[in-house]
Amino acid sequence: GPETLCGAELVDALQFVCGDRGFYFNKPTGYGSSSRRAPQTGIVDECCFRSCDLRRLEMYCAPLKPAKSA
């Protein structure tokens, strides 16, 4: 469900959702819109200033690192 998350609670949420992948506060370049002029939206804009669906949090997780080959 939609929820408002700010400050330490937002960090706790991102840490738990993303786990060992880590996270970004702003979506990495190349996410979503291809327009270079489009303002970069961040998790604070999406989930603190407004309420966001919990699934949005996953959008800010870093990509899974490929397993290292021996």
């Epitope: 469900g1 609670e9 706790d12 840490q15 738990f16 959702v17 060992d20 992948r21 919990l54 997780c61």
Partner: antibody, heavy 121, light 109 residues
Framework: QVQLVQSGVEVKKPGASVKVPCKAS????????MHWVRQAPGQGLEWMGI????????SYAQKFQGRVTMTRDTSTSTVYMELSSLRSEDTAVYYC??????????????WGQGTTVTVSS | DIQMTQSPATLSLSPGERATLSCRAS??????LAWYQQKPGQPPRLLVS???NRATGIPARFSGSGSGTDFKLTINSLEPEDSAVYYC???????????FGGGTKVEIK
């Protein structure tokens, strides 16, 4: 169908560790969080902690901090709960329980059948 | 940490009667509360989520109500198979966590 399968019985000596598995099937393993809850004989339910099978992150009850470790193996859809420095008071039934966290609904909707851990010298 | 207190500890009623079980949180938990039924030798079964939403397959005689700090589980027209221990559980969002109440034992005379 959706199910969580746990091992049956574990007998351990005081000071030892126990690692309890919980194998999930019938759903997407990484889409649901997993709790561990224990119940001592004749007592109520006690929450121990939770693991996110996708990222591997954990949150533990303060009482168990430093003694409990929850891990997962996504290749076998199994979560594990390891409890160290066992004492007689840890004798209990240990349950894993699924949480449909992303739906926003509160509640553990699927439970394992429980693993009985007996700590005795 | 939030404490959950259930009352009464035991409730002894006859078939067909109404059971009202209470659960009180030490601080406001909104509607982040679930109820479970547990019979001897079995794992708990989810009855109600979000304080008032009956879980899949749960008979309509079970209903949950309340928000904030005071919650109730009502069992209308008790049946012999409702003899069990009932637990409430609060959910903390971030980092995720949970607390159970001490339970209410419902006995059918």
């Amino acid at each position: 169908q959706v199910q969580l399968v746990q091992s049956g019985v574990e007998v351990k000596k005081p000071g030892a560790s126990v690692k309890v598995p919980c194998k999930a099937s019938g759903y997407t393993f990484t889409s649901y969080y997993m709790h561990w809850v224990r119940q001592a004989p004749g007592q109520g339910l006690e929450w121990m902690g939770i693991i996110n099978p996708s990222g591997g992150s954990t949150s533990y009850a303060q009482k168990f901090q430093g003694r409990v470790t929850m891990t997962r193996d996504t290749s076998t859809s199994t979560v594990y709960m390891e409890l160290s420095s066992l004492r007689s008071e840890d004798t209990a039934v240990y349950y894993c329980a699924r949480d449909d966290f992303w739906s926003g609904a509160v509640g553990m909707d699927v439970w394992g059948q429980g693993t009985t851990v007996t700590v005795s010298s | 940490d939030i404490q959950m207190t259930q009352s009464p500890a035991t409730l002894s009623l006859s078939p067909g009667e109404r059971a009202t079980l209470s659960c009180r949180a030490s601080q406001d938990v909104g509607s982040d509360l679930a109820w479970y039924q547990q019979k001897p030798g079995q794992p708990p079964r989810l009855l109600v989520s979000d304080a008032s939403n009956r879980a899949t397959g749960i008979p309509a005689r079970f209903s949950g109500s309340g928000s904030g700090t005071d919650f109730k589980l009502t069992i209308n027209s008790l049946e012999p198979e409702d003899s069990a221990v009932y637990y409430c559980q609060q959910r903390r969002r971030w980092p995720p966590g949970a607390t159970f109440g001490g339970g209410t034992k419902v006995e059918i005379k």
